[in-house]
Interface confidence: low
């Protein structure tokens, strides 16, 4: 009867350097003897060499020389008594493309090279990007931990080395960024930033990386109100807005944020719970009244916090003259004469190019002024 | 400085052997994986051979295979490739290339001329 | 083996001329690819790598772009000293390959 050596092993296998991959393998060999139970041995060689002499690739016989190049990245899996002979090839080295076969070893009578079942190894180079895992959200302000994996490497061969870089990173403190987890406190000015998490073998030529762009929450910390595309000067959370009355006005609120916060314009200065004349963040009013003068609050409400302005509109209005009109009366002529602006204006009356003011005496000459707004009386 | 320098190249007869030398200095040797790369007379460039820095893995060009041998002395700073069974066709310039980043071959050697002709 | 194909052989230009140079790759090489300069008589010299990445030294009128399959190697201003030979290699699969070059000469 044929002796039956039979290997089950896939005949190619595909990894890209620096990566790791299992080589799923299980083998059957003639073995009858009941009255003794030498120990037995397999063995990975590289194709083309000769079983007696070179060194192999992985074994499990502690006298076997195993060579440098794969000691500790080539290893056997499994119970190689229940017929396991599954490798494990850990940091995928360019070198390692090639053949390989399997050999049995079992007392005097089982020695055997399964040279018809060969691996085929083929080591590509390394397109596989590592991951960044954000374990909570970023907020400005707040700590968080990120953390940066090659998905497919293993424990062996040399250690991995990281790198980080990004604007959101602090330059002053280098070896925080030399590691494979990294403690990130964002600024508002960080969102959108790329954040680049850079891999390396050591001892190896070719690094991996991955970028990301953060995306930052943050609270607004700045309002500002465009006039026909023209900011607003801002003094202490108030903005002043001198305006024409009956002038049509278009005012838009602008309160940078991640994610955008919900913009809204209330009259005057609103109470928290106030109803909005405006659900966004532009206010029109199709004609402006002297009645608005008190003004309008732009309010940005966001998860992380609110901030508001103040709009102080001065409403103001060219002057219309009633006047003047004078008429003889017991004490002798009286003329009277009305403005009607706001401010309210002042009125002087002219003799012979003299001014009279206010309230005043000059001669025979007298004069009543009031100003109640937006009239302004003179007679 | 970075340098590497051939030599050994020269007038062989077909079937004949010769082998050549490459001296690196300026870097730590061992670090680096090392190639033998040809130009045959007006032609392009073409990879014929590469070994990794311990010199435990080898490899070769499909038409070099089994006649040319490439080995590294790492305590002498030295690569070698011995060219047996020469062909007409083996005849060019032999550059030893250094392995830069991205597998590229950042440094190279001046290049030894090496004619195959009866 | 992975086959590399330059274009064009052979192009004629004059100093100042901005010149472009291809490559394409039988199968997809991510970014595995390098450029080289070779003037008669002398070694390559490496100019690019990694598709996108100027070698330290080299100038930055040389720019390398593409990803995949595709590769351009870019001259923004043409001077007297890059008249030479032009080859990418793919260094993405063993064995290494190269292209057939591009030999720029003067108009």
């Known amino acids: 009867e044929k002796p039956v050596y039979e290997l089950q092993v896939q005949k190619s296998v595909t990894v890209q350097e620096g990566l790791c991959v299992l080589v799923p393998c299980s083998f059957s060999y003639p073995w009858r003897s009941w009255y003794s139970s030498p120990p037995l041995y397999v063995y990975w060689f590289r194709d083309g060499e000769i079983p007696y002499y070179a060194e192999v690739v992985a074994t499990n016989n502690p006298d076997r020389r195993v060579k440098p190049e794969t000691q500790g990245r080539f290893r056997l899996l499994g119970d190689v008594q229940k017929k396991n002979c599954s490798l494990s090839i850990g940091d995928a080295r360019m070198e390692d493309t090639g053949s390989y076969f399997f050999r049995v070893e079992r007392g005097r009578d089982v020695k055997y090279s399964y040279q018809q079942n060969k691996l085929n190894l083929e080591v590509t180079a390394l397109i596989e990007k590592p991951d960044i895992h954000f374990l909570e959200p970023l907020e400005s302000g707040r700590p968080t931990r990120l953390s940066c994996s090659l998905p497919g490497s293993c424990e062996a061969g040399p250690p991995l080395t990281f790198s980080w870089t990004g604007n959101a990173l602090s330059p002053l403190d280098p070896e925080t960024t030399r590691s494979s987890e990294l403690t990130l406190t964002p600024r508002p000015e960080d969102h959108g930033t790329n954040l680049t998490c850079q891999m390396k073998r050591q001892g190896a030529q070719v690094t991996t990386e991955r970028t990301v762009q953060l995306n930052v929450s943050y609270a607004p910390q700045t309002i500002t109100i465009f006039r026909n595309g023209i900011a607003l000067e801002i003094l202490q959370n108030t903005s002043y807005l001198p305006v024409l009355e009956g002038q049509a006005l278009r005012l838009l609120c602008d309160a940078p944020s991640n994610p955008p916060a919900h913009l809204s314009w209330f009259q005057g200065s609103p109470a928290l719970n106030a109803t909005p004349i405006s659900n966004t963040g532009i206010l029109e009013l199709r004609r402006v009244r002297s009645a608005e003068k008190g003004g309008f609050t732009c309010r940005a409400q966001h998860p992380l916090g609110f901030l508001q302005i103040f709009l102080n509109l001065s409403v103001y209005s060219l002057p219309q003259l009633l006047g003047p009109s004078c008429s003889w009366e017991a004490e002798g002529l009286h003329c009277r004469c009305s403005f009607r602006a706001w401010p309210a204006p002042s009125l002087c009356w002219r003799l012979e190019e003299k001014p009279l003011e206010g309230n005043s005496s000059q001669g025979s000459f007298k004069v009543n002024s009031s100003s109640p707004g937006p009239w302004a009386n003179s007679s | 400085e970075v340098q590497l320098l051939e030599s050994g190249g020269g007038l062989v007869q077909p079937g004949g052997s010769l082998r050549l030398s490459c001296a690196a200095s300026?870097?730590?040797?061992?670090?680096?994986?090392l190639s033998w790369v040809r130009q045959a007379p007006g032609k392009g460039l073409e990879w014929v051979s590469g070994?990794?820095?311990?010199?435990?893995?080898?490899f070769y060009a499909d038409s070099v295979k089994g006649r040319f041998t490439i080995s590294r002395d790492n305590s002498k700073n030295t690569l070698y490739l011995q060219m047996n069974s020469l062909r007409a066709e083996d005849t060019a310039v032999y550059y030893c290339?250094?392995?830069?980043?991205?597998?590229?071959?950042?440094?190279w050697g001046q290049g030894t001329l090496v004619t195959v002709s009866s | 083996d992975i086959q590399m194909t330059q274009s064009p052989s052979t192009l004629s230009a004059y100093v100042g001329d901005r010149v472009t140079i291809t490559c394409r790759a039988s199968?997809?090489?991510?970014?595995?690819l390098n450029w080289y300069q070779q003037k008669p008589g002398k070694a390559p010299k490496l100019l690019i790598y990694?598709?996108?990445s100027l070698q330290s030294g080299v100038p930055s009128r040389f720019s390398g772009s593409g990803s995949g399959t595709d590769f351009t190697l870019t001259i923004s201003s043409l001077q007297p000293e890059d008249f030479a030979t032009y080859y990418c290699q793919q260094s993405f699969s063993a064995p290494d390959t190269f292209g057939g070059g591009t030999k720029v000469e003067i108009k």
């Open positions: 199968q997809i090489i991510s970014t595995y």
């Open positions: 300026g870097f730590t040797f061992n670090y680096y994986a």
């Open positions: 990694s598709a996108s």
């Open positions: 290339a250094r392995r830069g980043g991205w597998y590229s071959f950042d440094i």
């Open positions: 070994i990794s820095g311990s010199g435990g893995t080898t």
